[in-house]
Interface confidence: low
């Protein structure tokens, strides 16, 4: 019906034709040089074909192409067409780079823009079998050719193709690299439940490795582990102890599996523990020691159970590196069973056991409190000889308002005198002993300090010019002594301090200044401590005038003189009365005077004359004397 030539290249043609839908048995195609120089080519093709590539023609040559179909022995009319092949453009050189075991890179040179595309054919040299045909765009000058066989010689042919023709082929021969393979398979760090597998490879980018682990006797199914292609070692845990294994590995790279490498290895024996021993037993502790396979255990579990099952079970987890343990905080005189097991990542060993009995605690007893007084008391106790390193005495007030006081004493002491406590409050005393670092249960006692002894009712009486009498009250049998402190209120003289034995409750104080105000303080002393003081104010009496003398005596007058007391007075009163009886007479003079004239006396009479000093309402004792007036005459 219609015959066309498309894609006429420099050495071939592509034919397309149309035909009705008769069941053609075949088509016959004839190709002949237009000048009939060469014999025509006759081709037979299947009847369902409607296109055909015709290669192997001459460059720049005119051709006549004819076709007819055959159906049920009938030949259709011939269809013909004329066409020419093109001239060959120049290809440059073709080279091969980056030759691998399954690929290479093809490079070539060619004029820019000359070719619509390039046609590349890859043949195996030994079989001359075409393994790849590919067409690439005309702008390319390089192409990767993957999917090749390792260690194989190839012929690679390159043609440039334009709109009308293809170039003469350029060829190159190349040998691919050998296959990648693993090497140096070894097993390191073999433990009882695992191992580390190491291998070496050529320097290629493996996708992954497949590791196969199987018991040598094939009892269990093999484990297949896939590991990343970047690794050259892998841990394989979860194996059985003391078991032979075959470990195999292959690499996968671009869909290719390397040959498998294998090695045989046996896991180590299962880890063990043993020789559990008890040592260094004390009332509250003991030490444990044991043996164990090194480098295996993460942890040991120690369980401590008292034989009577009265105490809560104690469990201790300790590092797998340890081979000893110190067990403390136990009660004395108690039987224990000790269980030990070792724990590794996927195993707990069978439990081993031993027994231990804590020692009895030395005795500490009979806590006694004696010599209680307002400021303290004595604590005493009994204890086993040479059993204790030290004692701890703790004293705390019953109200728990104050910080506890703690006293650490040597193990030889059995008594502690406590001083400096607060009077009249309750105290709790705890005594415990220390032996080999362990503390006994404390003994406990309570007591109350006595009330503070008091002095009271300080009274002043019988004031004299140089003193006065003091009296006071105090609790009986408490005080060792009393102290009286006296000082004039104006602080013109040094204070006096008088110490008295305890039975006394009065004291005459002398040697003071007359008419002087004194402050008095009295306190008791008990066991070296002072009671609260009591105070009073007292004033000494005025001093009396002294050394009365008479002079210038006449029948009806006389002069009386005296020495004034030390302290200033307001006045002096002079009283004179006949010895034989009669009304007394009085004269008052200024306190600065020390003499006065007595007048209107009776001649030849004996008079008693008294002088007193006065200040306010206070009067001094008198100074007295007698005089006899002269007779008339």
């Amino acid at each position: 019906e219609n015959l066309t030539v498309t894609e006429a290249g420099w050495d071939g043609l592509r034919l397309n034709w149309t035909a009705d839908d008769l069941a053609y048995e075949y088509f016959v195609i004839q190709v002949q040089e237009a000048n009939n120089v060469e014999t025509a080519h006759n081709f037979t093709v299947p009847g369902n074909l409607r296109a055909a590539d015709i290669p192997g023609l001459k460059v720049a040559t005119s051709y006549r192409v004819s076709i007819y179909g055959v159906a049920r022995g009938y030949r259709t009319p011939v269809l013909s067409a004329e066409t020419s092949t093109g001239t060959t453009p120049n290809l440059g050189e073709v080279t091969v780079a980056e030759v691998g075991w399954d690929a290479l890179t093809l490079n070539w040179t060619a004029p820019e823009g000359a070719y619509k595309n390039f046609f590349i054919q890859v043949l195996e040299a030994d079989t001359t079998q075409t393994v790849q045909n590919l067409t690439v765009p005309g702008g390319l000058r390089s192409v990767d050719l993957p999917g090749l066989k390792a260690a194989t010689r190839y012929y690679i042919t390159l043609r440039g193709v334009t709109q009308d023709f293809g170039t003469a082929p350029l060829s190159v021969e190349v040998l691919t690299e050998d296959l990648p393979q693993l090497g140096g398979l070894s097993v390191t760090e073999v433990s009882w439940d695992g191992l580390t597998l190491n291998w070496t490879t050529d320097d290629l980018a493996y996708k992954h490795f497949v590791v196969q682990v199987q018991e040598a006797n094939n009892v269990e199914a093999a484990q297949n582990l896939t590991v990343p292609g970047s690794l050259r070692a892998v841990d394989i845990p979860g194996l059985k102890a003391d078991t032979p294994y075959r470990v195999s590995i292959y690499g996968v790279i671009q869909g290719y599996r390397t040959p498998m490498l294998s090695t045989d290895v046996s896991t180590a024996r299962e880890p063990e523990i043993g020789n559990l021993n008890v040592s260094d037993v004390t009332p509250k502790s003991f030490n444990l020691s044991w043996t164990a396979t090194d480098g295996i255990f993460d942890m040991f579990t120690i369980e401590i159970i008292d034989s009577n099952r009265l105490l809560q079970t104690a469990e201790h987890n300790i590092s797998g590196a340890e081979r000893t343990a110190h067990i403390s905080g136990l009660p004395p005189s108690t039987d224990f069973i000790v269980y030990l097991s070792g724990i590794a990542p996927s195993i707990r060993t069978k439990t081993i056991s031993t027994t231990a009995t804590t020692e009895a605690l030395p005795l500490l007893e009979n806590l006694t409190i004696s010599d209680t007084n307002p400021y303290g008391f004595t604590v005493s106790w009994t204890a086993s000889e040479n059993a204790f390193d030290s004692f701890l005495v703790t004293v705390v007030d019953s109200g728990k308002l104050l910080d506890p006081q703690e006293f650490t004493l040597s193990g030889t002491q059995r008594k502690l005198e406590l001083r400096g406590l607060i009077t009249g409050i309750g105290y709790e005393v705890l005594v415990s002993g220390f032996t080999q670092g362990h503390q006994t249960k404390p003994l406990r006692a309570e007591t109350i300090t006595e009330a503070e002894p008091e002095v009271d009712n300080l009274l002043v009486s019988d004031a004299t010019p140089d003193g006065f009498r003091l009296s006071w009250t105090a609790d009986e049998g408490i005080f060792d002594s009393f102290v009286i402190r006296i000082r004039d209120t104006k602080k013109q003289s040094e204070p006096q301090e008088i110490s008295l034995p305890s039975p006394e409750r009065t004291r005459d104080i002398t040697g003071l200044r007359e008419a002087t105000e004194y402050e008095i303080e009295l306190y008791g002393i008990s066991r070296g401590r002072r009671s609260q003081p009591v105070s009073a104010i007292a004033t000494t009496a005025m001093g009396s005038p002294k050394e009365i003398m008479f002079s210038d005596i006449t029948e009806n007058a006389a002069t009386v003189s005296w020495r004034a007391p030390t302290a200033q007075v307001e006045s002096f009163r002079i009283t004179y009365v006949p010895m034989t009886g009669g009304a007394p007479s009085m004269v008052t003079v200024d306190g600065t005077d020390t003499e006065t004239r007595l007048v209107k006396l009776t001649p030849g009479v004996e008079y008693r004359v008294s002088v007193i000093a006065m200040k306010g309402f206070e009067e001094s004792d008198p100074v007295s004397g007698t005089l006899i007036t002269a007779l008339d005459g």
């Epitope: 760090e189 695992g194 580390t196 590791v211 484990q223 582990l225 896939t226 590991v227 990343p228 690794l231 070692a233 892998v234 841990d235 394989i236 845990p237 979860g238 993460d298 942890m299 579990t301 987890n317 724990i343 590794a344 990542p345 996927s346």
Partner: nanobody
Framework: QVQLQESGGGLVQAGGSLRLSCVAS???????????LGWFRQAPGKEREFVGA????????YNPDSSKGRFTISRDNAKNTVYLQMNMLKAEDTAVYYC???????????WGQGTQVTVSS
Amino acid sequence: QVQLQESGGGLVQAGGSLRLSCVASGTSGLTFRSFGLGWFRQAPGKEREFVGAISMTGGTIYNPDSSKGRFTISRDNAKNTVYLQMNMLKAEDTAVYYCAVNGLGLNYDYWGQGTQVTVSS
């Protein structure tokens, strides 16, 4: 008993990365380094699939069908934590990711609650 808690999941664009963490606690006195740990995933309507694992001493293994060279597992014993680094994520990586104790597909006794990873295309 051991508790495992995963974190780090979430929504990520295709081609992106995520780092999942799994913290172990309550190891009953055992050190964390005593455990192998594995990562698994379960896509909707599919069976749980093994992604990879890390052994006690830090060796790692992977499922090539799920990881395709894009996933990396690591651990930090000091922090009791195992990690799953996922690069070049694809929509088919969408799943709930779980961590489990004892690795290498052998006896995974303890499992976390899982963390959802969603890869949008």
